[in-house]
């Protein structure tokens, strides 16, 4: 199933995926004057087992002279199947990068892409906030939210964050980005109330959730 | 594959200046920050400075403050550090870098970080004699 909304907006803050599970889709989005080659991939695919995980296929633009109109479309399950298979690596990528067993890192960039990337994340994926610069964090609980299923809908769990419009006290590069948790907190299939805990994306393990799919789009 | 290409390291005497270039042929600024590292032998890769494609704001080390100034040419696709009162500690192996930014077209200090951009250039080495 799609998650029906997008991750929700807090004042003040921006969100980020920090990394992409499995089933994860990411449209092949051309900036204006460009489009997708013929016979090109619609969408880059997270795939993998256990141990790896990468993007099939490759986002391929090139110039047009009349605009891409072309519909955006949620490939189908058999669709995927079908795909030819080419990882994107990064060159130069430290040795120190971090991996998430069943997750993909942020695709690299490929030449003219749209500015947005819309992706199509399946439940459990997580997504990150932080106060832009000149606003000061007051954590509640985690600043983060999950893509959940609960009495079969999806949602998205409310990031416990209040931005304030006090300047950071902290210094680049003080902060550490947080490191993606490979899913959400175990939180009870039967019950509607959302429990959370101190923000510990990093030490903290988490449960297995259901695989749907949903659309967004952040920059 | 859209790379990143660096130009403009080189030897210079300790207060003196350079100007590196990062050329990204390709690259949608506008929906990255793009900015630079450097390590120097035996150390950590550590952030400089980066540049908001999409709105224009800098961030700089707290080490290079008042002394680098990060530029874009969003026409001709590329970044340029300028450095002045370059100091010995300022040699090393400089990096660009590009990394996605966030909901809002934001970005934070925070995830300027070696293990996390999303593309890297080669690198352009930097030597300061004292």
């Known amino acids: 199933e799609l998650c029906d909304d997008d991750p929700p907006e807090i004042p003040h803050a921006t969100f980020k995926a920090m990394a992409y599970k499995e089933g994860t889709m990411l449209n092949c989005e051309c900036k204006r004057g460009f489009r997708r080659i013929k016979s090109g991939s619609l969408y880059m695919l997270c795939t993998g087992n256990s141990s790896h995980s990468s993007w099939d296929n490759q986002c391929q633009c090139t110039s047009s002279a009349t605009r891409n109109t072309t519909k955006q479309v949620t490939p189908q399950p058999e669709e995927q199947k079908e795909r030819k298979t080419t990882e994107m690596q990064s060159p130069m990528q430290p040795v120190d990068q971090a991996s998430l067993p069943g997750h993909c890192r942020e695709p690299p960039p490929w030449e003219n892409e749209a500015t947005e990337r819309i992706y199509h994340f399946v439940v459990g994926q997580m997504v990150y906030y932080q106060c832009v610069q000149g606003y000061r964090a007051l954590h509640r609980g985690p600043a983060e939210s999950v893509c959940k299923m609960t009495h079969g809908k999806t949602r998205w769990t409310q990031p416990q964050l209040i931005c304030t419009g006090e300047m950071e006290t902290s210094q680049f590069p003080g902060e550490e980005k947080p490191q993606a948790s490979p899913e959400g907190r175990p939180e009870s299939e039967t019950s509607c109330l959302v429990t959370t805990t101190d923000f510990q994306i990093q030490t903290e393990m988490a449960a297995t959730m259901e695989t749907s799919i949903f659309t967004t789009e952040y920059q | 594959q859209l790379q990143l290409v660096e130009s403009g390291g080189g030897l210079v005497q300790a207060g003196g200046s350079l100007r590196l270039s990062c050329a990204a042929s390709?690259?949608?600024?506008?929906?990255?920050?793009i900015g630079w590292f450097r390590q120097a032998s035996g150390k950590e890769r550590e952030g400089v400075s980066y540049?908001?494609?999409?709105?224009?704001?800098?961030f700089y080390a707290d080490s290079v403050k008042g002394r680098f100034i990060i530029s874009s040419d969003n026409a001709k696709n590329t970044v340029d550090l300028q450095m002045n009162s370059l100091k010995p500690d300022d040699a090393a192996v400089y990096y660009c870098?590009?990394?996605?930014?966030?909901?809002?077209?934001?970005?934070?200090?925070?995830?300027?970080?070696?293990?996390?951009?999303?593309?890297w250039g080669k690198g352009t080495l930097v030597t300061v004699s004292s």
């Open positions: 870098a590009v990394d996605r930014l966030g909901s809002r077209g934001a970005y934070v200090s925070s995830w300027w970080r070696s293990p996390d951009m999303d593309l």
């Open positions: 390709g690259l949608t600024f506008d929906g990255y920050a």
């Open positions: 540049i908001n494609g999409r709105d224009g704001s800098t």
